[in-house]
């Protein structure tokens, strides 16, 4: 008779990231007997839901179940049936839903209600759907990348698990860019965090962390573009907007009603003598950069120093992982290499934005034109946000690491969120046998 392998004693968890532009489902797996060890949880699957973000279903809430079904069915196939009932499912919605809630709490609640009803139909242990705060989004992103980099482990390693990992236990800062918001989170060096709203205290694995975090709502790449268009159309002499952030020869008609649909453009709203206008690209990086800078109010700062819009930002400290759209955009532009200096990035952006639209379309035939057309803006926006918004310099640019995955797990807030909600980050350093802990993040 053959020796039968003992069943793996593993656990699974599912987190859905309901972002402004799309929803992704992540499946995590870990050995049951090592729950409190650092670095044991890893991602086994990402399923990107085909379609827009959940906030777009506000007029079609009854269809949210249809929208989620493929990825949820995928989860039922990936996770062994015997584990279904004990697998927790969490859905966290971010800035797209924060914006919808600003417009109508009732509509946001209706969307979440249908999401909850839909997810409750599956054989998992559904734990709820909620809009997470910007502070949570920043904090959980910071926990994720430092957990995956092994920064919370007390065992110093003589080897590096990822190319940009330093062997010291200094944590990485986290830079997250979404479609509707952006987060900056890091441990400042012996600096008091002057605004209580931006201060977090954690005790993780026996060590205290004083963390700075801020989420800038409306400063994700998609909402920043809407802001820029709303700002620029104010001073347009007619219904033609010559825009340096789009390639020469690019043309697109925009409905004014779409422009003013988002709360992010309210501050620029005015009565225009036309219902539509045409963007005509002129592809000039420097002018695009200048136009973007006008979105950052740097004239007012009630603290020792600020990022923009009067928000406190301590001096930058240490290395930073830049993920989500920071990574996707820079990856598309082929600018994620550690060897590319800030000056070189700027140089390459100048060349890219100046390329004629017809040429760009031919070079990237497989990419949807809407997304393709926005890379010039997005790349320029990333540079503007990091340099002028967050005060990175040509020197400190080298401390930014554009990262998609660490050890096979996506960088982002979802892993940190699950680790916290499943009580897998102990406040104290676990002994060799796992103990139960009552104090968690």
């Amino acid at each position: 008779t053959q020796n039968k392998a003992l069943p793996e004693n593993v656990k699974y968890g599912i987190v859905l990231d309901a972002g402004s532009s799309h929803t992704s489902l992540y499946i995590y797996k870990w050995p049951a007997e090592k729950e409190n060890d650092t670095g044991v949880v890893h991602q086994v699957e990402e399923c990107r839901v085909k379609g827009p973000g959940i906030s777009k279903f506000v007029q079609k809430v009854n269809e949210i179940g249809i929208y989620l079904t493929d990825c949820m069915a995928r989860a039922t196939a990936v996770i062994p049936r015997s584990q279904h009932q004990e697998t927790p499912v969490y859905l966290g919605a971010t800035a797209g839903m924060r914006l919808l809630r600003m417009e109508s709490e009732e509509l946001a609640d209706r969307v979440l209600d249908v999401v909850e009803r839909s997810l409750s139909n599956y054989p998992f242990d559904f734990q709820g759907a909620r809009i997470i705060t910007g502070q949570e989004e920043g904090a959980y992103g910071w926990i994720t990348i430092n957990y995956l980099l092994g920064k919370f482990s007390q065992k110093t390693r003589w080897f590096s698990i990822v190319p940009y990992e330093t062997n010291n236990q200094e944590t990485f800062g986290a830079l997250d860019l979404g479609g509707a918001s952006t987060q900056v989170t890091f441990v400042p060096q012996n600096q008091t965090i002057e605004s209580p709203d931006n201060a977090l205290q954690f005790r993780l694995y026996g060590k205290d962390y004083n963390v700075y975090t801020h989420s800038f709502l409306c400063y994700g790449k998609d909402q920043a573009l809407w802001q820029k268009l709303a700002k620029d159309i104010q001073v347009a002499s007619n219904e033609i907007l010559r825009d340096p952030c789009f390639h020469p020869g690019y043309k697109k008609v925009v409905n004014v009603s779409d422009l003013y649909k988002t709360p992010c453009t309210k501050r620029f709203e005015m009565t225009l003598p036309f219902q539509q206008f045409e963007i005509q690209g002129i592809g000039n990086y420097q002018q695009c950069h200048q136009s973007i800078l006008e979105l950052f109010n740097t004239s007012y700062c009630p603290y020792s120093q600020c990022a923009f819009n009067g928000i406190f930002l301590p001096p930058l400290q240490g290395d930073f992982g830049a993920f989500s759209a920071f990574y996707f955009v820079m990856k598309f532009l082929n600018l994620t290499s550690e060897k590319v200096s800030q000056e070189k990035v700027t140089e390459m952006m100048k060349k890219f934005c100046a390329q004629p639209w017809e040429e760009i379309k031919t070079s990237y035939a497989g990419v949807k034109e809407k997304y393709l057309s926005e890379y010039c803006f997005s790349g320029t926006y990333i540079l503007s946000l990091l340099l002028q918004g967050y005060h990175f310099t040509a020197d400190s640019w080298e401390h930014i690491h554009f990262i998609g995955k660490i050890q096979g797990s996506d960088a982002g807030w979802t892993l940190g969120y699950m680790l916290n909600l499943t009580n897998m980050i102990p406040a104290e350093q676990p002994l060799s046998t796992p103990l139960s802990h009552s104090t968690y993040v």
Partner: antibody, heavy 122, light 111 residues
Framework: EVQLQQSGAELVKPGASVKLSCIVS????????INWVKQRPEQGLEWIGR????????KYDPKFQGKATMTSDTSSNTAYLHLSSLTSDDSAVYYC???????????????WGQGTTLTVSS | DIVLTQSPASLAVSLGQRATISCRAS??????????MNWFQQKPGQPPKLLIY???NQGSGVPARFSGSGSGTDFSLNILPMEEVDAAMYFC?????????FGGGTKLEIK
């Protein structure tokens, strides 16, 4: 505008193999699923299977397993259907199609290729 | 496999009148609170076109005269008022379970 452009008609001998292509334009192939559907002259529709080009995951009708292999190439935004050990029963029009939500708005729409006519004959 | 039986096999309806096509599944196509039943239209020499998804939702750009209903095993497609351009083959399709299957089709003609 979303378009699926299929390769031209094929005349092949029994026992041979063929690879049909479906070039997608107007959207990123990774943002959708691609289905393959078979239709014999004056007959109904048969679902062969579906591929998720984002990760290569496939679902097949078991009766086409071993006969059909679906693949995709995200760099060229193209889906492929490879048919092997061809017999006269494989003579049909083969469609590639996508149906589902648009990636910007909550609009559910479908797009089909024009169909590739495969004739298996000696 | 889930077998879909369409009825009638052919149907002639006067312009402006209601056309009703039925589809019965050999087992329920409901799952997770959703009815995984779709309807397609096909005209000669053309690929099929999605009309209805998840039993009752209209595809993008589909005229309001097309509606779908039903749950479990019994579904129907209604066209009201019937127009000349609606003469075509109609297929029901289930996507609850692999293999996804189509009904045998209903030929709709103008009376």
């Amino acid at each position: 505008e979303v378009q699926l452009q299929q390769s031209g008609a094929e005349l092949v001998k029994p026992g041979a193999s063929v690879k049909l292509s479906c070039i997608v334009s107007g959207f990123n192939i990774k943002d959708t699923y691609i289905n393959w559907v078979k239709q014999r002259p004056e007959q109904g529709l048969e679902w062969i299977g579906r591929i998720d080009p984002a990760n290569g995951n496939t679902k097949y009708d078991p009766k086409f397993q071993g006969k059909a292999t679906m693949t995709s190439d995200t760099s060229s935004n193209t889906a492929y259907l490879h048919l092997s050990s061809l017999t006269s029963d494989d003579s049909a029009v083969y469609y590639c199609a996508r149906w589902g939500y648009d990636d910007e708005e909550a609009d559910y729409f479908d797009s089909w290729g024009q169909g590739t006519t495969l004739t298996v004959s000696s | 496999d889930i077998v879909l039986t369409q009825s009638p096999a052919s149907l002639a309806v006067s312009l402006g009148q209601r056309a009703t096509i039925s589809c019965r599944a050999s087992e329920s196509v409901d799952n997770y609170g959703i009815s995984f039943m779709n309807w397609f239209q096909q005209k000669p020499g053309q690929p099929p076109k999605l009309l209805i998804y998840a039993a009752s939702n209209q595809g993008s750009g589909v005229p309001a005269r097309f509606s779908g209903s039903g749950s479990g095993t019994d579904f129907s497609l209604n066209i009201l008022p019937m127009e000349e351009v609606d003469a075509a083959m109609y297929f029901c399709h289930q996507s609850k379970e692999v293999p996804w299957t189509f009904g045998g089709g209903t030929k709709l003609e103008i009376k």
